[in-house]
């Protein structure tokens, strides 16, 4: 399977419910590129979950750019509202949720959480500090979000969601105030973790701008993007200092895009990718 055929489960930094994208590039921020032409193009906006118009400079940019509204919709939106609801909420659990709790061969008495497939709940266990398996979460919340079912057999999805009949988009019913960030570091720190196209399973780190931390991910060995570090320290050095958190009192803030050569793509946390 190529990367383009895979669906990605994501959480955006505005705390929308998880969205399954048909293609990973649909999550990229509209990128006008460094050139100065004025060309009308369309991109998929993961905040509004709609295809929207933007002005393209004529060179570089990214794959989230389409000649027509129809092409954008075809590539990045689901045409069936029920299908959107289903794929958004009724996600399959990652395989590692079904692995048994494994403390590993070391003995460090570290409190972690695992999904117990017998009780169908996340539970605490003592992790030894090395090896073990991926059914191992730092927080109960993280474990629940990834492995537990919600009340209707859906994946846990901490936000009520309703279908907006006007534009077929999903509207979050969350009263949570989204935290937004001003970023002054390298643009690649805002890109999603990208496994790439090969078949290796290398331990790497990416900067998760949603939570402001460097997180491990499995790199396929080729492709991907620059948000890819061989150590946590390297990741933190490159990305951590660039963030200034800014709390917004309102809902979503629309910021005016400035023309600049540095390309900043939208930030999201990739929870899991098939074949990881």
């Amino acid at each position: 399977d190529s990367e383009e055929d895979e669906e990605h489960t994501i959480i955006t930094d505005t705390e929308l419910p998880p969205l399954k994208l048909m293609h990973s590039f649909c999550a990229f921020k509209a990128d006008d590129g460094p050139c100065k032409a004025i060309m009308k193009r369309f991109f998929f906006n993961i905040f509004t979950r709609q295809c929207e118009e933007f002005i393209y400079g004529g060179c570089e940019g990214n794959q989230n750019r389409f000649e027509s509204l129809e092409e954008c919709k075809k590539m990045c939106t689901r045409d069936n509202a029920n299908r959107i609801i289903k794929t958004t909420l009724q996600q399959e659990k990652p395989d590692f949720c079904f692995l048994e709790e494994d403390p590993g061969i070391c003995r460090g008495y570290i409190t972690r959480y695992f999904y117990n497939n017998q009780t169908k709940q996340c539970e605490r266990f003592k992790y030894g500090g090395c090896l073990g398996n991926m059914n191992n979460f730092e927080t109960l919340e993280e474990c629940k979000n990834i492995c537990e079912d919600g009340p209707n057999g859906f994946q846990v999805d901490n936000y009520g969601t309703q279908l907006n009949a006007v534009n077929n988009s999903l509207t979050p019913q969350s009263t949570k105030v989204p935290s937004l960030f001003e970023f002054h570091g390298p643009s690649w720190c805002l890109t999603p973790a990208d496994r790439g196209l090969c078949r290796a399973n290398e331990n790497r780190f990416y900067y998760n701008s949603v939570i402001g931390k460097c997180r491990p991910f499995k790199y396929s060995g080729c492709g991907g993007n620059e948000n890819n570090f061989t150590s946590k320290q390297e990741c933190l050095r490159a990305c951590k200092k660039g963030f200034i958190q800014r709390i917004s009192k309102g809902g979503l803030i629309k910021t005016k895009r400035k023309r600049k050569k540095q390309r900043v793509k939208i930030a999201y946390e990739e929870i899991f990718v098939k074949n990881m």
Partner: antibody, heavy 123, light 112 residues
């Protein structure tokens, strides 16, 4: 002082099962501060980890993918030992086999090794 | 699998002189809880391997202080400050960041 004493045949015929035992003194196979492993060494492959067992709230085992379909490591709590069984052997399984203790507490590593058993697979 | 690559494969040394062995991992050995998941072993001629350095830089009990381990990420080094005749043998690095546990191919240290 922990000591690991290996025993088992040095010659095994192809397609048969290689069986080795590692007797533990100075520690317990059921200890929650140790794990017990088999590692082999051959000129072609160097040191190759085969698998490990350990007891915490229950028994766990992990095996190398290269031998996963053929290997079993079992504890014997009554004799305070653990064993290796490797099925359907071929001449490529010819190696010196070591049992080793993984120290789980402060010193995370294979801190005690058996004396090694040269196993030749040949008809 | 994480591949551990050692260099040099052979190291002729002079007693009293320093020696250094490099070990590179194909993936970063994640440093969690301040621990580097890498060990060093010495296999003396005709013997089983013995643990020298654990968690990247800690000497195992009974190991002389002329041995030291350092490094992080993918690059690690074992140093012997002043080689002694009893230090000859094959040195191996080993990772326990992920299964399967893997060893380097070994560095043979011999007296010139």
């Amino acid at each position: 002082q922990v000591q690991l004493q290996q025993s088992g045949p040095g010659l095994v015929k192809p397609s048969q099962t290689l069986s080795l035992t590692c007797a533990i003194s100075g520690d317990s196979v059921s200890s929650d501060s140790a794990a017990w492993s088999w590692i082999r060494q051959s000129p072609g492959r160097g040191l190759e980890w085969l698998g490990i067992i350990y007891k915490r709230s229950k028994w766990y085992n992990r095996y190398a993918v290269s031998v996963k379909s053929r290997i079993t490591i079992n504890p014997d709590t009554s004799k305070n030992q653990f064993s290796l069984q490797l099925n359907s052997v071929t001449p490529e399984d010819t190696a010196v086999y070591y049992c080793a203790r993984w120290h789980s507490d402060k010193m995370w590593g294979f801190d005690d090794w058996g004396q090694g058993t040269l196993v030749t697979v040949s008809s | 699998d994480i591949v551990m690559t050692q260099s040099p494969l052979s190291l002729p040394v002079t007693p009293g002189e320093p020696a250094s062995i490099s070990c590179r991992s194909s993936q970063s050995l994640v440093m969690s809880f301040g621990i580097t998941y890498l060990n060093w072993y010495l296999q003396k001629p005709g013997q089983s391997p013995q643990l020298l350095i654990y968690k990247g830089s800690n000497r195992a009990s009974g190991v002389p202080d002329r041995f030291s381990g350092s490094g992080s990420g993918t690059d690690f080094t074992l140093k012997i400050s002043r080689v002694e005749a009893e230090d000859v043998g094959v040195y191996y690095c080993q990772q326990y960041d992920s299964y399967p546990l893997t060893f380097g191919q070994g560095t043979k240290v011999e007296i010139k």
